[in-house]
Interface confidence: medium
């Protein structure tokens, strides 16, 4: 999957570990796709290092990445989206390491947005809704979402719920009364495309009602 420079070439460079990882985002800007790569070792000296992608492209053989601080980035319409591309780290014309990657298997969706929680007093529940830009996309339409919520005081005690829709109901009796909760959501491809979790949406905070002593229910 990866090949290093031959002995005698770039002796200094050979001492470094040029392992890298990438993710793609399809139709991230209208019909434009993006591909982002970064070295796994944050201490790699990236001076003079370039990334190049070849194969499974439309109209061109290869494309060069732009460098943005420590990440390497392409935005283009030219991904064929069938077949594997060869992504290489290069110094000049010499490849230091390469990976064959199908861009449809490293898709990172855009983060969900407009997360909100509405309390329904009559139903004694909370309706969680959020939005995703992927509903309008041609390619990565089907996602699985991970809704995570916690009581604000329980720093690492997150409860996770997986769902394919953008609406979730939380029963009031499952939550602590008179408590502040934090909730957030992320997405991952769930049909044909494969890849990684999106970034988390911005968190939403909501308070549960107090218990009504006469009925034993929350206010």
């Amino acid at each position: 999957e990866s090949g290093y420079a031959q002995n005698g070439d770039l002796e200094d460079a050979e001492l470094d570990d040029y392992s890298f990882s990438c993710y793609s985002q399809l139709e991230v800007n209208g019909s434009q796709h993006s591909l982002t790569c970064a070295f796994e070792d944050p201490d790699v000296n990236t001076t003079n290092l370039e990334f190049e992608i070849c194969g499974a492209l439309v109209e061109v053989k290869c494309l060069n990445f732009r460098k943005l601080q420590e990440i390497y980035f392409i935005e283009t319409k030219k991904f064929l989206l069938i077949g594997k591309s060869n992504i290489c780290v290069k110094v000049g014309e010499k490849s230091l390491t390469c990976k064959k990657i199908d861009l449809t298997t490293i898709v990172k969706p855009e983060a969900p947005f407009d997360l909100s929680v509405i309390y329904r007093e009559g139903a004694n529940d909370f309706v969680v809704t959020f939005n995703t830009s992927h509903l309008q996309k041609k390619y990565v339409k089907v996602l699985m979402h991970d809704v995570a919520y916690r009581q604000e005081k329980d720093e690492n005690k997150w409860t996770h719920v997986n769902l394919s829709s953008t609406k979730l109901t939380l029963l009031q009796r499952k939550l602590q009364p008179a408590a502040m909760y934090e909730i957030k959501v992320r997405s991952i491809p769930d049909h044909y495309f494969k890849g990684f979790w999106s970034e988390w949406s911005p968190s939403y905070y909501f308070r549960t009602p107090e218990i009504n002593n006469s009925s034993g229910e929350m206010d």
Epitope: E59, K61, L81, G83, N86, K100, D102
Partner: antibody, heavy 121, light 109 residues
Framework: EVQLVESGGGLVQPGRSLRLSCAAS????????MHWVRQAPGKGLEWVSG????????GYADSVKGRFTIFRDNAKNSLYLQMNSLRAEDTALYYC??????????????WGQGTTVTVSS | AIQLTQSPSSLSASVGDRVTITCAAS??????LAWYQQKPGKAPKLLIY???SLESGVPSRFSGSGSGTDFTLTISSLQPEDFATYYC???????????FGQGTRLEIK
């Protein structure tokens, strides 16, 4: 040496089934989409079906859709075409072809020598 | 589906002649076109990809040009081994689909 060898052709009655195989060697099979292309006697080339390297992208010509199934076994470096409900018009020389998308587009850069399918009663 | 129409369907020419075969797509396909040569009893052979890129090992007398809907295969100086049938081919990636032209038969005059 890059090589594709088709097998499984023969004489079959209309309505019956046949399975073609293509054994690949000399290249990394699971890096490439693969295709079946046929040529009826004295006629031109007709694309039949194609399958992406991981079997997630599959396409068929309208003339065979619903009757033919393409599949592959990357562990065995093999491509297959299951042909059901065969018709007289399916009579042809069937080629297996390797796809070289690194050329920028689907292009069929290596072909087998073909296997003959004759559908007749 | 996109149709490819080759012209002429057949032509006669002599060794040393310059020959041009055209392929017209029913809608724009950028440069997503390849050319193949097929000799009787043999499998097709890739000549040109990306409309104008010469496949490795193919003689430089073969060249391709065009973009969008109109494409051309040119043989600058016919050799005896060039008498064959030539096909253009295009592809679509979603859904996976390949189309061939109907072929042009090049015969010795």
């Amino acid at each position: 040496e890059v090589q594709l060898v088709e097998s499984g052709g023969g004489l079959v009655q209309p309505g019956r089934s046949l399975r073609l195989s293509c054994a690949a060697s000399g290249f990394t099979f699971d890096d490439h989409a693969m295709h079946w292309v046929r040529q009826a006697p004295g006629k031109g080339l007709e694309w039949v079906s194609g399958i992406s390297w991981n079997s997630r992208g599959i396409g068929y010509a309208d003339s065979v859709k619903g009757r033919f199934t393409i599949f592959r076994d990357n562990a065995k470096n093999s491509l297959y075409l299951q042909m059901n409900s065969l018709r007289a018009e399916d009579t042809a020389l069937y080629y297996c072809a390797k796809d070289e998308y690194s050329r920028g587009y689907y292009v069929l850069d290596v072909w087998g020598q073909g296997t003959t399918v004759t559908v007749s009663s | 589906a996109i149709q490819l129409t080759q012209s002429p369907s057949s032509l006669s020419a002599s060794v040393g002649d310059r020959v041009t075969i055209t392929c017209a797509a029913s809608q724009g396909i950028s440069s997503a076109l390849a050319w193949y040569q097929q000799k009787p009893g043999k499998a097709p052979k890739l000549l040109i990809y990306d409309a104008s890129s010469l496949e490795s090992g193919v003689p430089s007398r073969f060249s391709g040009s065009g973009s969008g809907t109109d494409f051309t295969l040119t043989i600058s100086s016919l050799q005896p081994e060039d008498f064959a049938t030539y096909y253009c081919q295009q592809f679509n990636s979603y859904p996976l689909w390949i189309t061939f032209g109907q072929g042009t038969r090049l015969e010795i005059k």
